[in-house]
Amino acid sequence: GWVWNQFFVPEEMNTTSHHVGRLRSDLDNGNNSFQYKLLGAGAGSTFIIDERTGDIYAIEKLDREERSLYILRAQVIDITTGRAVEPESEFVIKVSDINDNEPKFLDEPYEAIVPEMSPEGTLVIQVTASDADDPSSGNNARLLYSLLQGQPYFSVEPTTGVIRISSKMDRELQDEYWVIIQAKDMIGQPGALSGTTSVLIKLSDVNDNKPIFKESLYRLTVSESAPTGTSIGTIMAYDNDIGENAEMDYSIEEDDSQTFDIITNHETQEGIVILKKKVNFEHQNHYGIRAKVKNHHVDKQLMKYHTEASTTFIKIQVEDVDEPPLFLLPYYIFEIFEETPQGSFVGVVSATDPDNRKSPIRYSITRSKVFNIDDNGTITTTNSLDREISAWYNLSITATEKYNIEQISSIPVYVQVLNINDHAPEFSQYYESYVCENAGSGQVIQTISAVDRDESIEEHHFYFNLSVEDTNSSSFTIIDNQDNTAVILTNRTGFNLQEEPIFYISILIADNGIPSLTSTNTLTIHVCDCDDSGSTQTCQYQELMLSMGFKTE
């Protein structure tokens, strides 16, 4: 049978050849004509056999980390017969490890984030080194971790590579640390190889600082002309924290006048003092308010850092502005009866200079030929007014300071022209009526209605009558319907076209004004030769033809 021991070759041997061992058949007594052969991957290249003795040599430098074992086959032939002395056999050459690989941190770069003020023992990160050497071969791949840089704030567990906090750190003093970890193989014994890695440890912010005003007193000014909502200035607090932990809210702590407000600009973290109510220099020319600032987000466990909010005092000076004249009222409404004579009194407007110097005021009316105003604000008419032409006048009255003509105010003045009964009622339209020659008595000839250009305080009420002469002629009569209409009826039977082709009836219409006015209105009635049906349509048609120059038979 085959005789051999386990074959080992140390890796990284620098000699040109290294004796691995000897393959031998127990039938080989040294005098036999036995020839040994080596087959398989690595035979003839990595490993050479002395075919006469069976001695195997490694002729290449081997790297266990590249290949840790070779599986080869051995043959032995008796050259006298050419036959195999032993069955072909497989054997293994193991490459034995030497400590030729340093530990390597394969996952670098390492970066960790840990909250500031974390207590001792807080886990930061675990770093792991790999050693390509054989973990089962002595201590070649047994690693020990140590801290080369990072004391006294950090420590590393020697066997696990777990980095922990060993001292509290304040991000506001230093926000990141470079820690250098060394991994040594051979559990740190002499001849150990080492590798290092750097770990960037960043401290994340916790809200351990409250915002504090940069100034204990701010002086701001506001123009008395500033509208509400005007930003009159900014105040600023600083917070050593960052991000969300530095977000702050400003608010008013004291403002008896309730004139100001503070809003927070969350982009710049400034407090903006806002005018909540308009100020008046002449009324109050300075204010004092107190503002406070707090963080927007505060965790319960960090409340100890935020017990008293920082405050500041804000002095606000009101700046005087030359203000335009101020009318007593925002608008005026005056009334005047129509038909009053030119120069009649309409009303008085009044404006004053709100400033302390109290400039005299001049008044004017913009684009009006009907009214006039004097320096006392008295408005008079320049013409007689007719309500039926214009019942309202919209005036623009301007007040100008005498000392500063650029200071102008305008207000609307509405003048209502009041009605007087100066128009009698009249027909609402022109009426042309027709009656048949054969018309009977009491036949309705026309319904009439009236209009009155005057304004009625209540309802207009019109009264209809025939004139005295027409009443006496008695060919027609009128009935007042009591609804501002009346009907004209025949007062006899039969009419003669030849004798009296047209009747002109005078109708009196009176209104219910005080005093009452009456008008006389003429109604024209044509006599027609009607057909048997008594229709005046043909009569009207004939009239139409005649009016157009045609003659009808």
């Epitope: 040109t16 050849s17 004796h19 040294g30 005098n31 036999n32 004509s33 020839q35 050479i48 002395d50 075919e51 006469r52 003795t53 001695d55 040599y57 002729i59 050259i79 006298t80």
Partner: antibody, heavy 120, light 108 residues
């Protein structure tokens, strides 16, 4: 063609170590077996042993205890050391090429030989 | 080890004559692994025959080898003046390699 040249001291004192070197030219030492053969004056040839280019050796049992062979492929040389010499070791020492891998072969070519005398 | 015995120890012949040299092994030589060398005074041996019967490169055909097992022969068909020398046989079928004592061919 391949040529071999022995070199070393021609005189060695008894009990000392005889050292010879064979330099191969005109070809590589790698891939071959290299032998040392000696011939005492007026006598026959005696095979001392061989060295394979990888360093494997096989010595004549009659001399095994005193012989050491080595090879330096980078210099294309191989060497012989024979320790504890006596007058009986006086001979012409030849180096010769045996075959390449495989069983033993004849010797060809040979060096021209160097005479080593053991004498005090 | 295999002991090779060469005979005769000396062979006296004239040029042009045939020379027959014998080499006998103490045990069979594997696969006829036997070689013949020629050695002239002051020179290294020179290979003539290997494998019992194969001529080495450049060797004249008047030299021939034969035999197997334990008996081997070197024949020089017509001796030339330059052929007068010592002839050695060597077996390489077993370790250690051994040589015969040599046969001297001299001019008669």
């Amino acid at each position: 063609q391949v040529q071999l040249q022995e070199s070393g001291p021609g005189l060695v004192k008894p009990s000392e170590t005889l050292s010879l070197t064979c330099t191969v030219s005109g070809g590589s030492i790698s891939g071959y077996y290299w032998s040392w053969i000696r011939q005492p004056p007026g006598k026959g040839l005696e095979w001392i042993g061989y060295i394979y280019y990888i360093g494997s050796t096989n010595y004549n049992p009659s001399l095994k205890s005193r012989v050491t062979m080595s090879v330096d492929t980078s210099k294309n040389q191989f060497s012989l050391k024979l320790s504890s010499v006596t007058a009986a070791d006086t001979a012409v020492y030849y180096c010769a090429r045996d075959g390449s891998s495989g069983w033993y072969r004849w010797f060809d070519p040979w060096g021209q030989g160097t005479l080593v005398t053991v004498s005090s | 080890e295999i002991v090779l015995t060469q005979s005769p120890g000396t062979l006296s012949l004239s040029p042009g004559e045939r020379a027959t040299l014998s080499c006998r092994a103490s045990q069979s030589v594997s696969s006829s692994y036997l070689a013949w060398y020629q050695q002239k005074p002051g020179q290294a041996p020179r290979l003539l025959i290997f494998g019992a019967s194969s001529r080495a490169t450049g060797i004249p055909d008047r030299f021939s080898g034969s035999g197997s097992g334990t008996d081997f022969t070197l024949t020089i068909s017509r001796l030339e003046p330059e052929d007068f020398a010592v002839y050695h046989c060597q077996q390489y079928g077993n370790s250690p390699l051994t040589f015969g004592g040599g046969t001297k061919v001299e001019i008669k």
